[in-house]
């Protein structure tokens, strides 16, 4: 990387190195030969998360309930607010600027991974021996009933959407 004129946490202004403002503070005035850099703390609902020479702090993110958002972590003078989605919803992007309803897995599919505030439901097709007869954001594929363990026989084969139907064994006369 190219050489720098100043130390870490300094910046060059008027051929002189001045201290940057620490996180949580903004620049009021550059240093001079006789005075240090003047910084001021960010106001309520504002933040700066790096050593900086910004003259304005950034506004904390607003978690808009109309978009399904709620506060996951309140912002400080050094950190932004972190939003997440209401129960049953998830973020549409990493920045979590809006939410969408968790997808449900259709009959014949089960939930492989339950949705979180930041990821959607992951569905998987029910393999042979398993079924799902509901549209759900929580239900996994269920195993077919084992007729044998109930001393019954299969009267109707199962599918990926239906369980087997068990019935009594035919008695030998």
């Amino acid at each position: 990387e190219p050489p720098t004129a100043c130390r870490e946490k300094q910046y060059l202004i008027n051929s002189q190195c001045c201290s940057l403002c620490q996180p949580g503070q903004k620049l009021v005035s550059d240093c001079t030969e006789f005075t240090e850099t003047e910084c001021l703390p960010c106001g309520e609902s504002e933040f700066l998360d790096t050593w900086n020479r910004e003259t304005h702090c950034h506004q904390h993110k607003y978690c808009d309930p109309n978009l399904g958002l709620r506060v996951q972590q309140k912002g400080t003078s050094e950190t932004d607010t972190i939003c997440t989605c209401e129960e049953g919803w998830h973020c549409t992007s990493e920045a979590c600027e809006s939410c969408v309803l968790h997808r449900s897995c259709s009959p014949g599919f089960g939930v492989k991974q339950i949705a979180t505030g930041v990821s959607d439901t992951i569905c998987e097709p029910c393999p042979v021996g398993f079924f799902s007869n509901v549209s759900s954001a929580f239900e996994k594929c269920h195993p077919w009933t084992s007729c044998e363990t109930k001393d019954l026989v299969v009267q109707q084969a199962g599918t990926n959407k239906t369980d087997v139907v068990c019935g009594p064994q035919d008695r030998l006369r």
């Epitope: 050489p3 004129a5 100043c6 051929s15 002189q16 190195c17 201290s19 240093c31 030969e33």
Partner: antibody, heavy 126, light 107 residues
Framework: QVQLVQSGAEVKKPGASVKVSCKAS????????MHWVRQAPGQGLEWMGW????????NYAQKFQGRVTMTRDTSISTAYMELNRLRSDDTAVYYC???????????????????WGQGTLVTVSS | DIQMTQSPSSVSASVGDRVTITCRAS??????LAWYQQKPGKAPNLLIY???TLQSGVPSRFSGSGSGTDFTLTISSLQPEDFATYYC?????????FGGGTKVEIK
């Protein structure tokens, strides 16, 4: 008391590399930038660059960019300076020198060297 | 880069003499200047920093002055142990640069 002890003299062929060490004691190694300064025989002082032992950040003089690497091992309070593709005009005494404490400086870089290593003579000759 | 020009390059003086060495920067460096003394085969020794502040343990016969581009190191009464080479160094911005040195010799 503060001490900077450097590795011994080296003789290298042109095109080779040299790595000089500087072991610090008597103070908090991560609290002060470490600089490297060289002095060719009968010549003046030439600044090569610095390393911040706390962050590992470095800053090299343009002249040495791409040829010098400064590193540190905080577990043994030692700074290193490696110079590659040596030429005969790299023959010099290489010094490590301790800067003022981190956070001491508010205006200017105010890099003044209150403690120096004893110097390491690097001779580049075919 | 900031060029530092020292003068004279050498000076012959006697014990008890007042010796003045000047250092000029190619651009303003405020008061960010240091002076070092170096004896043959030894590392430099910090005498003065921020143009006029005496480093701890340095005799008071050494003094520094100046700001901007013109600086002076004065030895008020030269002692036998003061025969050495003196360097100025700007500490305003990187790259740090040194003057070419002034050798103080016995007359």
């Amino acid at each position: 008391q503060v001490q900077l002890v450097q590795s011994g003299a080296e003789v290298k062929k042109p095109g080779a590399s040299v790595k000089v060490s500087c072991k610090a004691s008597g103070y908090t190694f991560t609290g002060y930038y470490m600089h490297w300064v060289r002095q060719a025989p009968g010549q003046g002082l030439e600044w090569m660059g610095w390393i911040n032992p706390d962050s590992g950040g470095t800053n090299y003089a343009q002249k040495f960019q791409g040829r010098v690497t400064m590193t540190r091992d905080t577990s043994i309070s030692t700074a290193y300076m490696e110079l590659n593709r040596l030429r005969s005009d790299d023959t010099a005494v290489y010094y490590c020198a301790r800067d003022q404490p981190l956070g001491y400086c508010t205006n200017g870089v105010c890099s003044y060297f209150d403690y120096w290593g004893q110097g390491t003579l690097v001779t580049v000759s075919s | 880069d900031i060029q530092m020009t020292q003068s004279p390059s050498s000076v012959s003086a006697s014990v008890g003499d007042r010796v003045t060495i000047t250092c000029r920067a190619s651009q303003g460096i405020y008061s960010w200047l240091a002076w070092y003394q170096q004896k043959p085969g030894k590392a430099p020794n910090l005498l003065i920093y921020t143009a006029s502040t005496l480093q701890s343990g340095v005799p008071s016969r050494f003094s520094g002055s100046g700001s901007g581009t013109d600086f002076t190191l004065t030895i008020s009464s030269l002692q036998p142990e003061d025969f050495a080479t003196y360097y100025c160094q700007q500490a305003n911005i990187f790259p740090l640069t040194f003057g070419g040195g002034t050798k103080v010799e016995i007359k």
